[in-house]
C-alpha cells in the first residue's frame, strides 16, 4: 500500500517517499523506485537554508551601499548574507533593508544607550545636578562642577543645559 506520510527529511511524490535535498543544495530530479533524489549544490551567491525540494536556490541579499548598507556576514550556500548599516546609521527594520542616521540627544538630554547598526540612540533627560550643552549621539549627561571641592562658591546655579558657574568666596552676596 502506498505511504500517506513520510519520515522527517523526506517528501511524498508519486506515491513514494523521496529524500529532501540538504541545506545548500537544490532538487534536480525526484527519486524513483530505482534511483535516489538528485540534488545539486547552489551556485555562487545562492543559498538554501533548509532541507528542501526547491528547484531553484535563493539569491543572497544584496547590501546596497547607496542605502547605507554593508555586509555584516557573508552568505554561504546554506545561509543568506546579513546586512548592517555603515557607521553612524542604523537599520529601519528588523530585516535591515535600509538605513537612517542615528538620532542625536538634544541639549538637556544625554545618551542612555549608544546606537548600534540595528538600534537607534536612546536619550534620557539630564536630572538635577547633571547637564548636557551639546547635541550628541555619544555624550552622556555630565555632573555639575563641584565649586566646594575647588574652594569656590556657586555664582550661578546649573541647569539641565548648563554647568554651574563657580566664583571666589569673596564674590558671594
Amino acid at each position: 500500500e502506498p505511504p500517506t506520510a513520510c519520515r522527517e527529511k523526506q517528501y511524498l511524490i508519486n506515491s513514494q517517499c523521496c529524500s529532501l535535498c540538504q541545506p545548500g543544495q537544490k532538487l534536480v530530479s525526484d527519486c524513483t523506485e530505482f534511483t535516489e533524489t538528485e540534488c545539486l549544490p547552489c551556485g555562487e551567491s545562492e543559498f538554501l537554508d533548509t532541507w528542501n525540494r526547491e528547484t531553484r536556490c535563493h539569491q543572497h541579499k544584496y547590501c546596497d551601499p547607496n542605502l547605507g548598507l554593508r555586509v555584516q556576514q557573508k552568505g554561504t550556500s546554506e545561509t543568506d548574507t546579513i546586512c548592517t548599516c555603515e557607521e553612524g546609521l542604523h537599520c529601519t527594520s528588523e530585516s535591515c533593508e535600509s538605513c537612517v542616521p542615528h538620532r542625536s540627544c538634544l541639549p538637556g538630554f544625554g545618551v542612555k544607550q549608544i546606537a548600534t547598526g540595528v538600534s537607534d540612540t536612546i536619550c534620557e533627560p539630564c536630572p538635577v545636578g547633571f547637564f548636557s550643552n551639546v547635541s550628541s549621539a555619544f555624550e552622556k549627561c555630565r555632573p555639575w562642577t563641584s565649586c566646594e571641592t575647588k574652594d569656590l562658591v556657586v555664582q550661578q546655579a546649573g541647569t539641565n543645559k548648563t554647568d554651574v558657574v563657580c566664583g571666589p568666596q569673596d564674590r558671594q552676596r
Partner: antibody, heavy 122, light 113 residues
Framework: QVQLVQSGAEVKKPGSSVKVSCKAS????????IEWIRQAPGQCLEWMGS????????NYNQKFQGRVTITADTSTSTAYMELSSLRSEDTAVYYC???????????????WGQGTLVTVSS | DIQMTQSPSSVSASVGDRVTITCRAS????????????LAWYQQKPGKAPKLLIY???SLQSGVPSRFSGSGSGTDFTLTISSLQPEDFATYYC?????????FGCGTKVEIK
Amino acid sequence: QVQLVQSGAEVKKPGSSVKVSCKASGYTFSTSWIEWIRQAPGQCLEWMGSILPGSGSTNYNQKFQGRVTITADTSTSTAYMELSSLRSEDTAVYYCARGDDGSYNRWYFDHWGQGTLVTVSS
Amino acid sequence: DIQMTQSPSSVSASVGDRVTITCRASQSLTFSVNQKNYLAWYQQKPGKAPKLLIYWASSLQSGVPSRFSGSGSGTDFTLTISSLQPEDFATYYCQHYYSYPWTFGCGTKVEIK
C-alpha cells in the same frame, strides 16, 4: 540643629501681595537651597520655586511665573517668598524647606518650616 | 512636567497591619549614569509640616523607624509600613526631584479601621 522659622499668619485682600519670611539657623544658609511649597485646604502639595541664597539663583514653577518672587538675605539668613495679584485660590499654608546643600546629592526636603497660613478674602 | 499618581487615595488599617502605598511617575525617575531613583516619601500629620521618611526611593532618613521602607525604580514606587503603629496614622506623599518643577503625589491617607 537645623531650624526654619516662618513668619505669622496673614489675611490679604484679592489683588494684593503677601511676603512670607523664613529664617534659617543651624547650617550654612548661603550654600543650601531654600524651597517654597504650598498646600491649599484639602489639596496636593505644590512646589512654587527655590533659591540658592549665596548666588541669588532661582527656579520657579511656571504656574506661578510672574506672580512669585523668591529672594534671600544672607546677612540675616532669611529667605522670602512674595506672591502678588492674590486670588481666593491662593488661600493656603505656605512652607519653606531646605533642599540641596551644595553636594548636588540631596534634593529632597529634609527640614521644613512650621508653615504660614495665608488667607485671601474680600 | 512629571506627573505623580498615588494610590490608593485612602486606606483603612489596624495597628499591626502591613500597609503598602504606591506611587507612579509619568516618566522614569531612574538615571542611568548613577542608577539613582529621584524619589522621596513624606509623612504629614494634621496641622503639621511634612516630614521626610525616605529619599532616593529606598534610603531611610535618619531617625525614621525601620518599619518604613521604600522600593521601586523607573516609574513605579512603593512605600511599605511593615507593622502599623498608632503614630503612623497620617497622610503620605511621594515627590520626585528628577527635574524642575518638583511635583508631589496627591497623598494617601492612612486611617484607623
